[in-house]
């Protein structure tokens, strides 16, 4: 939002000009080389001051006419030193120079702040010739004026490879204030001050500064640029921005919205991305951060089993990435999750709780008491054992894996039998006479096949020996029990 | 330190008029608005509005418009508050006091007591 | 216009009990500002911008409110505090006061 409140006209004379030709006069130049074609505005500001001796370089021409008179020295006639103008105005100034006609091949350049201006500007540079000297009158027009015009412009001319001068004409380019900082957009703490600034600047200086708050002036006084304002605290959010005065008019900053940082939203949309017998992956989507960067996470876990104690399992986690796998959980089991995350404020409430369910696990531990017999009559290996604890079996028995090794005499040759899920008891033919048998047994869920109990080993001897006694899982501890009957 | 010093006590006919004097100090007089506030006898703050020291600029409250004056003698960092034909209604202390940041009146003069009886 | 009412008008209070003084706005204020006079004395700024103490105002004190409803809050009233406290709203022009509560100590 800018509006310009004035303009304001500065007049400036405009001197006669010293010989014809010059840019006042209707007259028409003998010669005009363009530098550069565009619109010529019609302000024009004279390019000459009769009268007065120039102060910046001067040549002193050696050469001399036949008469041996020594000719006057070099220089560029005075012109109006500074010019005022308001922005996107036209403005034309020139410098002048008599010249005698014994040099040849006199050009005029324009420099501004110490840099050659050089390419599309519009510059024109006209000769009028007379008998003895040729006036000489570059222009220089700019159509419409930005800030980047403001600078000191001079013209220079070599000659007998001296430089003339030119003094330097200063252009002020004057507009409505001009944004170098304006307030920022931030998140704050509640009732607790913090600064704004706005920083504005000319031409035309001063620049006065107004805060506005919520379409209330905060100063009813202005402040010299630049401004600091110190919000002593916001209970709820605020439009902030600042009005940039000069004798031109004023410009308004952009609003910027401060908000008030609060404790997050609960996390929406918490799902189950996988699920295994001892772990759940879960992912959310984090709520409204409350305009405080999220820290961390928490997820909760409370076993959905109504005989269950009721305890919650608390999982801290990073905010990102949204995504964490809950451990350390039971096999065929029922979960109620719920997820809430913190800023700096607090913690957000806790999300809608989810169901989720463990899968079968394959049992965790190994079936208990496992004893080996040898039946000689019927020739085979009776095994017996217990199943192993409900809470440990992580899912339904759906039988047993029975691994049975036969060794002897270097020959080695295991064997696996599977067994249904409703004894505890099982029969093996002997492969194998005179030789070692190792058994082991594991429980076997949908989930799978579960740790082997530790081995036993049974002697089978010879056909015609005795029966004597079984071999048994030993007792923690000791060593592989071989049992020779 | 910042003071804002008021003129003395002012007793008035009906009719008459008075002006007072808020004198400021310890501070640069342009920078900050002067507030005028009256305190009838027994009754609360009434804010009567205020002048900009800048400018020069007066503004009023609604119920302050007419016979009430505010203006400045920047020289002398001095604020004044005339009022014209005097009623006895007008009977009050007045305060002058500094505008600041949302309107806080953050120094307040000792108030002149203005009393306007036949 | 913005018209404040402040309750209660006149409390009669013992030393170290708790006073609230409230500050109802006719429509929604950025901030209230509150100002402490005793008899024949000019207004003392007191808490400026809802909840930021003056300079030398005792931490006995407190201010808080947002929207229309402001409150002023002595913790444990002393002696000194018995005096009459204002109430004056920024964000809407004409600029306003509160009728005025009048603390006095038993």
């Known amino acids: 939002a800018i509006t310009e409140a004035r303009e304001e006209a500065k007049p400036y004379p405009l001197f006669p000009g010293p010989f014809p030709g010059s840019l006042q006069t209707d007259h028409t130049p003998l010669l005009s080389l363009p530098h550069a074609s565009g619109y010529q505005p019609a302000l024009m500001f004279s390019p000459t001051q009769p009268g007065r001796p120039h102060t910046g370089n001067v040549a002193i021409p050696q050469v001399t006419s036949v008469e041996s008179k020594p000719l006057p020295p070099l220089a560029f006639k005075h012109t109006v030193g500074h010019i005022i103008l308001s922005e996107h105005k036209g403005v034309k100034f020139n410098c002048s120079i008599s010249v005698p006609n014994i040099y040849q091949d006199t050009t005029i350049s324009w420099w501004k702040d110490g840099k050659e201006l050089l390419g599309a500007h519009h510059a024109i540079t006209q000769f009028y010739p007379d008998d003895e000297v040729t006036a000489i009158i570059a222009s220089f027009s700019i159509t419409s004026v930005q800030r980047s015009d403001n600078g000191s412009y001079i013209c220079k001319m070599k000659i007998n490879n001296e430089e003339i001068v030119s003094d330097p004409i200063y252009i002020e380019v004057q507009g409505l204030p001009h944004f170098t900082k304006q307030p920022e957009s931030m998140n704050v703490t509640r009732n607790t001050a913090f600064n704004l600034t706005c920083q504005a600047v000319g031409p035309p200086e001063p620049v006065n500064i107004f805060w506005v708050q919520n379409s209330s002036r905060v100063n009813e006084q202005p402040e010299k640029s630049p401004s600091v304002l110190t919000v002593p605290g916001l209970t709820e959010m605020a439009v902030f921005s600042c009005e940039a005065h000069n004798d031109k008019g004023l410009t308004v900053s952009k609003g910027v919205q401060i908000n008030i940082k609060a404790i997050p939203s609960p996390p929406t949309e918490v799902s189950i991305r996988n699920s295994t017998a001892h772990s759940i992956l879960i992912s959310w989507v984090p709520g409204f951060d409350g305009y405080s960067p999220f820290r961390n996470c928490s997820i909760q876990v409370k076993e959905a089993d109504p005989l269950s104690n009721g305890s919650v399992m608390i999982f801290n986690t990073s905010a990102l990435p949204h995504l964490y796998q809950i451990k350390q959980l039971q096999a065929l089991a029922n979960y109620s999750i719920g997820v809430s995350c913190m800023n700096e404020i607090g913690w957000s409430a806790v999300s809608p709780w989810i169901l989720a369910s463990t899968t079968e696990g394959a049992p965790s531990v190994a079936p208990l008491n496992v004893t080996v017999f040898l039946n000689e009559s019927s020739d085979n290996v009776d095994i017996r054992w217990m199943k192993p604890p409900t809470k440990q079996q992580d899912g339904e028995l759906v039988g047993y894996r029975i691994s049975h090794v036969w060794q002897s005499a270097g020959i080695s040759k295991e064997l696996l039998e599977e067994v249904g899920q409703n004894g505890s008891r099982a029969r093996i033919s002997v492969q194998v006479h005179n030789a070692t048998c190792t058994v082991r047994i594991a429980a076997v869920t949908r989930g799978g096949v579960g740790p082997f109990s530790d081995p036993v080993k049974i002697f089978i001897p010879a056909h015609g020996w005795v029966d004597y006694a079984p071999s048994s899982t030993p007792a923690p501890g000791n060593a592989d029990p071989v049992l020779i009957i | 330190q910042i003071q804002l010093v008021q003129s003395g006590s002012e007793l008035k006919k009906p009719g008459a008029s008075v002006k007072v004097s808020c004198k400021a100090s310890?501070?640069?007089?342009?920078?900050?608005?002067m507030n005028w506030v009256r305190q009838a006898p027994g009754q609360g703050l009434e804010w009567m509005g205020w002048?900009?020291?800048?400018?020069?600029?007066?503004t009023y409250a609604d119920d302050f418009k007419g016979r009430f004056v505010f203006s400045l003698d920047t020289s002398v960092s001095t604020a004044y508050l005339q009022i014209s034909s005097l009623k006895a209604e007008d009977t009050a202390v007045y305060f002058c006091?500094?505008?600041?940041?949302?309107?806080?009146?953050?120094?307040w003069g000792q108030g002149t007591l203005v009393t306007v009886s036949s | 216009e913005i018209v404040l009412t402040q309750s209660p008008d006149f409390q009669s209070v013992t030393p170290k009990e708790k006073v609230t003084i409230t500050c109802r706005a006719s429509?929604?204020?950025?901030?209230m500002h509150w100002y402490q006079q005793k008899p024949d004395q000019s207004p003392k700024p007191w808490i400026y911008a809802t909840s930021n103490l003056a300079s030398g105002v005792p931490s006995r004190f407190s201010g808080s409110g947002s929207g229309t409803d402001f409150t002023l809050t002595i913790n444990s009233l002393e002696a000194e505090d018995a005096a009459t406290y204002f109430c004056?709203?920024?964000?809407?022009?004409?600029?306003?006061f509160g009728q005025g509560t009048k603390l006095e100590i038993k």
């Open positions: 002048i900009n020291t800048y400018t020069g600029e007066p």
């Open positions: 310890g501070y640069t007089f342009t920078n900050y608005g």
């Open positions: 006091a500094t505008y600041g940041h949302y309107a806080w009146f953050a120094y």
């Open positions: 429509s929604s204020v950025s901030y």
């Open positions: 004056q709203q920024w964000g809407t022009k004409p600029l306003t």
